[in-house]
């Protein structure tokens, strides 16, 4: 029977900069029941606070609701593991909410085959940013990535779309059914999950781009 091993806070994420959650990995339990507590203070403060919500994020997590989340202040936090034999602390972790945003996937993915008379046909893909992300404030720049593949293919073809919310793809295999998905990330945050797949049938007379 030993004191607990050192825990590690390894992940913090915010869906929209208004709330966030951090998760820790327990160290060894020393063969005894172990309690974990997360304490934090914010830059410019000395007063330590305990995690406001250990439930929402699941096991070994701390969730900071709206009233506990500030974009203006860096959070300094650590996890304490305690059993009957003693305690151990994680390293201090510094968190700036701006840099942990992982948005929801983009919405309203629409895919259409366009066959203009005077130009080569193309696949037109359009989507909307996730609802929770407020792009009007200006500090939030979302970047998008598209992936597509014929239904039975193993490999995805990836296209980086930058900040635009629509994209054209010229090179496609005629007569194939394609799956299309899109995801997004802020400049310094994390990629969202891929959006649900949209299927599109490419006509047999679709001319491949040279």
């Amino acid at each position: 029977q030993l004191p607990p091993g050192k825990p590690e806070i390894f992940k913090c994420r915010s869906p929209n900069k208004e709330t966030f959650t951090c998760w820790w990995r327990p160290g060894t339990d020393g063969g005894l029941p172990t309690n974990y507590s997360l304490t934090y203070h914010r830059e410019g403060e000395t007063l330590m606070h305990e995690c406001p919500d250990y439930i929402t994020g699941g096991p070994n997590s701390c969730h900071f609701g709206k009233q506990y989340t500030s974009m203006w202040r860096t959070y300094i936090m650590m996890v304490n593991a305690t059993n009957q034999m003693g305690s151990s602390f994680s390293d201090e972790l510094y968190v700036d909410v701006t840099y942990i945003v992982q948005p929801d996937p983009p919405l309203e993915l629409a895919v259409e085959v366009k066959q203009p008379e005077d130009r080569k046909p193309y696949l037109w893909i359009k989507w909307s940013p996730p609802t929770l992300i407020d792009l009007k404030t200006g500090w939030f720049t979302l970047l998008y990535e598209i992936r597509l593949k014929p239904e039975k293919a193993a490999e995805w073809e990836i296209h980086f779309a930058g900040q635009q919310t629509e994209f054209k793809i010229l090179s496609l295999h005629p007569g194939q059914k394609y799956l299309v998905q899109v995801r997004c990330k802020p400049d310094h945050g994390y990629w969202s999950a891929w959006s649900p797949a949209t299927f599109i049938q490419i006509p047999s007379d679709f001319t491949m781009n040279d």
């Epitope: 992940k11 203006w72 510094y94 968190v95 840099y99 200006g138």
Partner: antibody
Amino acid sequence: QVQLVQSGAEVKKPGSSVKVSCKASGYTFTSYWIHWVRQAPGQGLEWMGEIDPSDSYTNYNQKFKGRVTITADKSTSTAYMELSSLRSEDTAVYYCARSFFTNWFAYWGQGTLVTVSS
Amino acid sequence: DVVMTQTPLSLSVTPGQPASISCRSSQSLVHSNGNTYLHWYLQKPGQSPQLLIYKVSNRFSGVPDRFSGSGSGTDFTLKISRVEAEDVGVYFCSQSTHVPFTFGGGTKVEIK
């Protein structure tokens, strides 16, 4: 404890490439961005670029765009910085540095001296 | 790119005396999220840089309270209230509001 251990000094010919490694330990490698910063002899610091090891997403200083490639190998917890078309002005100490969930550098490697000379 | 200009270039200080280093940026360092990402690093002789101050005025873990940072917008200052022998080295200001991140040219602090 957190450690960033870099590969040893290199001497390279102009026009060649160099690849510097940065092995991370003491934390979950995929959690935090790794940055590369260089320092020419007797000079200031110059940020070259960064990588998110979780998905290898990179941002580069446009000054080095096309010449620098930053990669990460999750299986060995190692980040790499490759600089091509070397010239004498690339003679410098190259540092890797780690952020938290922030955009400043809390931990630094010991530095790797790259000398470009014919 | 944002140009960071440090003054003075070098500083010779008697132990126990104060020291002050100025850093000026070519454009505002206020991020669109409201934060100011101006930091100070110290590079001791033969060592890698180490973080002293983040976001203008916040001391990093383990940094003695004789170090303090202040300023806003484009003008920033690092102060050492009482210089000690272990404070010798080159001090760099750095901004991470705008990409690419940039550093000042450095201020060398020596002991008289």
